[in-house]
Interface confidence: medium
């Protein structure tokens, strides 16, 4: 075995925006530190066969399979994949090791399989086997976290049944409103599953894995806060756990909290209380109402009452499956070129939606904001006054929703012209859709006022580019106009644009643009 080469097999993962991958260099730039695939001699195989650890790759990821050979002299090599031979160009690194690389750009199903590398050195021949498969992210899940009470302790456990195992963190904030935004200095994060400090203003639990991040807020009624004008509403699906926290602060301990569902006290075992003194010696009490697995009959008004505060209520609605309620009829808008305008969709949904805005096959991030009346709203303002079709798409675990918008920008026509031996055509994308006139320029009509009506064919809205209509007009050439200049004009309520075309010369035609406001 002394004469066997020392072989190292590595995997290099490239970040998707790594412009160096696939460049002409046979040694692409490394984006991340190489991962050792530990090439081991395969026992009981005829010949010398090394086997690398199996490689799992995400769809569309870019990787390099690399072999480092510590053997004297020159080497030659050949890659074989699915019975096809692939060129192989070894080179030597600074330590004088032979380096052989296989770059796989934007991994697809067709690129998965066994890659065989045959290497011939002065001393011996050997084979290296790589097995590349697509990581089955179909089995991946990321579920919204939920809460459980810790056995025999006043603490909450945050659970997210996700694959791969998620990192769970509590996101705590003790101030109000805007200052509780994710990156605010008022926000404290604790990367642990159990939380004992349950007196804070805003408590959320988040779970994250390769699929992203999902959070659940601990629904809270604060008797010291001015409530929303309308009753807050909490949706849950049958079988999910219900947790509502009621919080109150008073100058001393002489007050109590109670929960009622539809004017009936909650049963023992469906609530627990905690209290503490705050820094200014006032007493904070919290009372949790919880149901480990809700049924339809847990629907109703949950009211938290105090002997020293106004009571407050929340409406809990239990549904069989999630929903997205919104009007899906398409909407058309017509705006001026500099008018401020946003598309907006008002919806009610449970569980929370994931959404995108799409224009011209390009997706834009989607933000949603809760309104006072239990609805949410998503707005899109980044249209940059481009006319066309905009699509709002939303989905959650149980429902999908799509709404189409058309944006028309009021503007004067702009004319483009093209001509062939037999006809001249003009195109315009102004809005409202323009009307067309053709005029002949001659000695009799040097100002091109002689109207042409014969041989004109107008097509309104003949090409729909992502919802943007284009109007065209074609003039069939006749002997009467050959050799003359003709002018096509498009006009709408905002103005007129014209193009002048010379109709005699073969080859490229000179166009003279002429704008009239």
């Amino acid at each position: 075995n002394q004469d066997l080469p020392v072989i190292k097999c590595v995997l290099i993962n490239h970040k998707n925006n790594d412009s160096s991958v696939g460049k002409s260099s046979s040694y692409p730039m490394v984006s991340e530190s190489p991962e050792d695939l530990g090439c081991a001699l395969r026992p009981q195989s005829s010949g010398t066969v090394y086997e690398a650890a199996a490689v799992e790759v995400d769809v569309s990821a870019s990787i390099t399979l690399q072999v480092l050979v510590d053997a004297p002299g020159n080497i030659s090599c050949l890659w074989v994949f699915k019975h096809s031979s692939l060129n192989c160009q070894p080179h030597f690194d600074l330590q004088n090791r032979g380096v052989v690389s296989m770059v796989i750009l934007k991994m697809t199903e067709t690129q998965a399989g066994e890659y065989l590398l045959f290497i011939q050195s002065e001393a011996t021949n050997y084979t290296i086997l790589f097995t590349v498969s697509i990581r089955n992210t179909l089995l991946y899940t990321l579920r919204r976290p939920y809460f459980r009470k810790m056995e025999n302790q006043d603490a909450l456990v945050c659970i997210s049944e996700s694959v791969p195992e998620p990192i769970v963190e509590w996101v705590l904030c003790d101030s109000q409103g805007e200052s509780c935004k994710e990156e605010s200095p008022a926000v404290v994060k604790k990367e642990e599953k159990v939380l004992h400090e349950l007196f804070g203003t805003d408590i959320r639990c988040c779970a994250r894995n390769e699929l992203g991040r999902e959070c659940t807020r601990l629904f809270t009624i604060d008797l010291n806060q001015t409530p929303q004008t309308t009753l807050p509403q909490l949706f849950l699906k049958v079988g999910e756990p219900l947790w509502i926290r009621c919080k109150a602060v008073h100058v001393n301990h002489g007050f109590g909290l109670t929960w009622e569902l539809e004017n009936k006290a909650l049963e023992e075992g469906n609530y627990f209380e905690m209290s503490t003194y705050s820094t200014n010696r006032t007493m904070i009490r919290i009372l949790f109402a919880f149901v480990s697995s809700v049924a339809r009959n847990d629907t109703g008004y949950y009211t938290c009452s105090s002997s020293k505060h106004p009571s407050q209520s929340a409406l809990v609605t239990i549904v069989e499956k999630g929903f997205i309620n919104a009007t899906n009829s398409s909407e058309d808008y017509e705006i001026d070129q500099y008018e401020e305008f946003c598309f907006s969709v008002r919806f009610k949904a449970y569980p929370q939606i994931r959404c995108t805005w799409t224009f011209s096959r390009k997706s834009f991030p989607c933000e949603q904001k809760g309104l006072d009346n239990g609805y949410s709203i998503s707005k899109f303002c980044n249209h940059k006054h481009q006319p066309g079709e905009y699509i709002f798409h939303a989905e959650n675990d149980d429902a999908q929703f799509t709404k189409m918008f058309t944006l028309n920008i009021r503007r004067k026509p702009q004319v483009l012209a093209e001509a062939s031996a037999s006809q001249a055509s003009c195109f315009s994308d102004g809005y409202p859709l323009p009307s067309w006139t053709w005029k002949k320029c001659s000695d009799k009509s040097p100002n091109c006022t002689e109207e042409i009506t014969e041989g004109v064919w107008n097509r309104k809205a003949n090409r729909k580019v992502f919802g943007q209509w284009v109007s065209s007009s074609t003039l069939n050439m006749s002997e009467a106009i050959k050799g003359f200049l003709v002018k096509c004009c498009a006009y709408n309520s905002l103005g007129t644009s014209c193009e002048t075309i010379l109709l005699n010369s073969p080859g490229p035609f000179p166009f003279i643009q002429d704008n009239i406001s």
């Epitope: 001015t226 004008t229 309308t230 509403q233 106004p310 009571s311």
Partner: antibody, heavy 121, light 112 residues
Framework: QVQLVQSGAEVKKPGASVKVSCKAS????????MHWVRQAPGQGLEWMGL????????SYARNFQGRVTMTRDTSTSTVYMELSSLRSEDTAVYYC??????????????WGQGTLVTVSS | DIVMTQSPLSLPVTPGEPASISCRSS???????????LDWYLQKPGQSPQLLIY???TLQSGVPDRFSGSGSGTDFTLKISRVEAEDVGVYYC?????????FGGGTKVEIK
């Protein structure tokens, strides 16, 4: 029975401040929100804001922000509404009104008798 | 802010006859919990306002059942089945969906 008794009529000069009181009785003072609503002569009703008597937290209408202050004294079950930088258009009857418990639905089940504030130079 | 518009401005009525007042809001007052956040108040001459109807159609206790409220979303109606002399005054609708709470301009009901 529930009663809301307001302080007497006031005459003030432009630029001055006025403080109107509303004394509650016949119910647990800290368990109901108190609102202030005003009515200019021959005009309709205009909501000014509310106070949570338990915590003292307030919510004011935008038109009055910066000029109105609502406070409470739990020992006397009284709420106060102070309006500063008075102008002639602040001449109105000012009402305190209680909103039902249950918390989030604001309906005015009891009203004070009203306090006429006249702003005149 | 939500704008409340009432009509008519003035309503002369005959005792024993029905009367109807309309109230329109600039945005829907229907909450996702199914309730319409609209109340009706009556202010009799020289008195403080009093609550008649809340949540668009629920009669406040102690209010005669000749008063009824209906409507949903943005259009609401207060009906008096048979007007009595004591019903004169100014009727106001009020939205309680969001702060600031806003009132309609009022409808003055008087005997013909």
């Amino acid at each position: 029975q529930v009663q809301l008794v307001q302080s007497g009529a006031e005459v003030k000069k432009p630029g001055a401040s006025v403080k109107v009181s509303c004394k509650a009785s016949g119910y647990t003072f800290t368990s109901y929100y108190m609102h202030w609503v005003r009515q200019a002569p021959g005009q309709g009703l205009e909501w000014m804001g509310l106070i949570n008597p338990s915590s003292g937290s307030t919510s004011y209408a935008r038109n009055f922000q910066g000029r109105v202050t609502m406070t409470r004294d739990t020992s006397t079950s009284t709420v106060y509404m102070e309006l500063s930088s008075l102008r002639s258009e602040d001449t109105a009857v000012y009402y305190c009104a209680r909103s039902g418990s249950g918390g989030s639905y604001f309906l005015f089940d009891y009203w004070g008798q009203g306090t006429l504030v006249t702003v005149s130079s | 802010d939500i704008v409340m518009t009432q009509s008519p401005l003035s309503l002369p009525v005959t005792p024993g006859e029905p009367a109807s007042i309309s109230c329109r809001s600039s945005q829907s007052l229907l909450h996702s919990n199914g309730y319409n956040y609209l109340d009706w108040y009556l202010q009799k001459p020289g008195q403080s306002p009093q609550l008649l109807i809340y949540a668009a159609s629920t009669l406040q206790s102690g209010v005669p059942d000749r008063f009824s409220g209906s409507g949903s979303g943005t259009d609401f109606t207060l009906k008096i089945s048979r007007v009595e002399a004591e019903d004169v005054g100014v009727y106001y609708c009020m939205q309680a969906l969001q702060t600031p709470l806003t009132f309609g301009g009022g409808t003055k009901v008087e005997i013909k």
